[in-house]
Amino acid sequence: GDLLIQKTIKKQVVLEEGTIAFKNWVKTGTEVYRQFWIFDVQNPQEVMMNSSNIQVKQRGPYTYRVRFLAKENVTQDAEDNTVSFLQPNGAIFEPSLSVGTEADNFTVLNLAVAAASHIYQNQFVQMILNSLINKSKSSMFQVRTLRELLWGYRDPFLSLVPYPVTTTVGLFYPYNNTADGVYKVFNGKDNISKVAIIDTYKGKRNLSYWESHCDMINGTDAASFPPFVEKSQVLQFFSSDICRSIYAVFESDVNLKGIPVYRFVLPSKAFASPVENPDNYCFCTEKIISKNCTSYGVLDISKCKEGRPVYISLPHFLYASPDVSEPIDGLNPNEEEHRTYLDIEPITGFTLQFAKRLQVNLLVKPSEKIQVLKNLKRNYIVPILWLNETGTIGDEKANMFRSQVTGKIN
């Protein structure tokens, strides 16, 4: 019996036309939603004038349906048993699952001012930027609609820059009508224990963002893992959102719609400083902001974002060092709400439920030559928003899964 089941599973999780896995892999049968909470700054003037703590108030959720588009350019390579594809991006606003509309206004850090002052550290250039910031009536903070903040707006300051720069700014710009990849993953035909594991991303086995092992593209994309998952395993996966590979460890057994699943979570150790977790030394890319690599819980992904000072963390700086959150008032981290987990059906390796949570922050530093940043006395890693991307297997699919997979085993 068990061998027969194993044989069936091995056959059905291969990523090729005709298998259960392939059908769900090309276009996810699960509805995936991305909820955003925006950090609305309550005291912009006090921060700019007196370098006060930034008081934030989260507003949300604002919900979008995502990952509803089928993978594109799906190409099998029989020679090396891989399948390559593009994952198209799309987001549809869901008013009924949101607290407001895409036209809601927020006071947030001026993304262009913060980024430009960081990218152009030459003081003469900063003086040029200062005159353009003043001319465009820009400031350290700005009021933007949700739609602008997420998907892009024409920045008045950047529009005055006399040399070629992208004048459209947005945290996820460009998004709609773009695609992530090309991914090339093992299809499992020759070796089922490699199924869905990424061979190359954008044609490379490395990212070129980090030093040493930190730069490796490890594991799958977290949508599925090779079958017969053990609780003792450390599940590696790559997330293009955070420009790195990361891992999850077993936390507990969960019953999901009658299906026994393993809950794997991202441990705090994954976000620790090299002092605590020496493996993380290569994620520390500079010495000043990281306080000689002793700070933890924030990841500088500027190299992956054309030099823009983007820092990724968990929501509300969960698992981050006190010095990171100290200049920000209004944060309340808690594991239940703010950690990332994957609920994996161990026999197939399919992720049947997940909650991917992350926070997007931007570094802003004092600048002697930029008037609106001149009074700052310290660096701030400013939270802009946090997101919760979730997906749960539908009832119909769960019934099918129970009858065809877990039911047969029990």
Epitope: Q121, N122, Q123, F124, V125, M127, I128, N130, S131, V161, P162, Y163, E368, K369
Partner: antibody, heavy 122, light 107 residues
Framework: EVQLQQSGPELVKPGASVKISCKTS????????MHWVKQSHGKSLEWIGG????????AYNQKFKNKATLTVDISSNTAFMEFRSLTSEDSAVYYC???????????????WGQGTLVTVSA | ETTVTQSPASLSMAIGEKVTIRCITS??????MNWYQQKPGEPPKLLIS???TLRPGVPSRFSSSGYGTDFVFTIENMLSEDVADYYC?????????FGAGTKLELK
Amino acid sequence: EVQLQQSGPELVKPGASVKISCKTSGYTFTEYTMHWVKQSHGKSLEWIGGINPYNGGTAYNQKFKNKATLTVDISSNTAFMEFRSLTSEDSAVYYCASDYFYGDANPWFAYWGQGTLVTVSA
Amino acid sequence: ETTVTQSPASLSMAIGEKVTIRCITSTDIDDDMNWYQQKPGEPPKLLISEGNTLRPGVPSRFSSSGYGTDFVFTIENMLSEDVADYYCLQSDNLPLTFGAGTKLELK
């Protein structure tokens, strides 16, 4: 050793244009800002403008906005200043001066060319 | 535009004397003042940069102080080689502006 070598003296007629060059060596050209400074005979110094060779970003003293054009040629590590519609008021020594801005100390005009004398005369 | 008023226009001092030159700016420029020395037939030379920072290789008899709008440049014990023109430059905002200069001569 950082060196800025300017082109030789120029005698030009009123209404004409002149293009002065400043060839650099001893450093990474794109990492330093290049400025141009005017010094009329027996007078003080006037900042004309500056250019960031890395991206071509320029800033001019409004007084010279319609008079001077600053450019660079990265392949030859050379900065240029073109001065147009010359009058006797433009007779002066013109200096190129560069500075390096990374780190805490900000040395404006740390390195200078030897100067180019421009004489405007009919 | 920040105007820089430099005084005195000329100064005649004996060797060993203390030399003081002053620059006043029309706007608050923090400590973004620089000082240059120019000898005849030569380009100016940077002595002191922003934040009253003495440049490497410049003798310690040269110093400066000041913040906001009032700045002072000092030569503690004048030597004959210090005969030159001296200029201040504000680098807080564009356009960068120089003082009119001080001609330092030997008494």
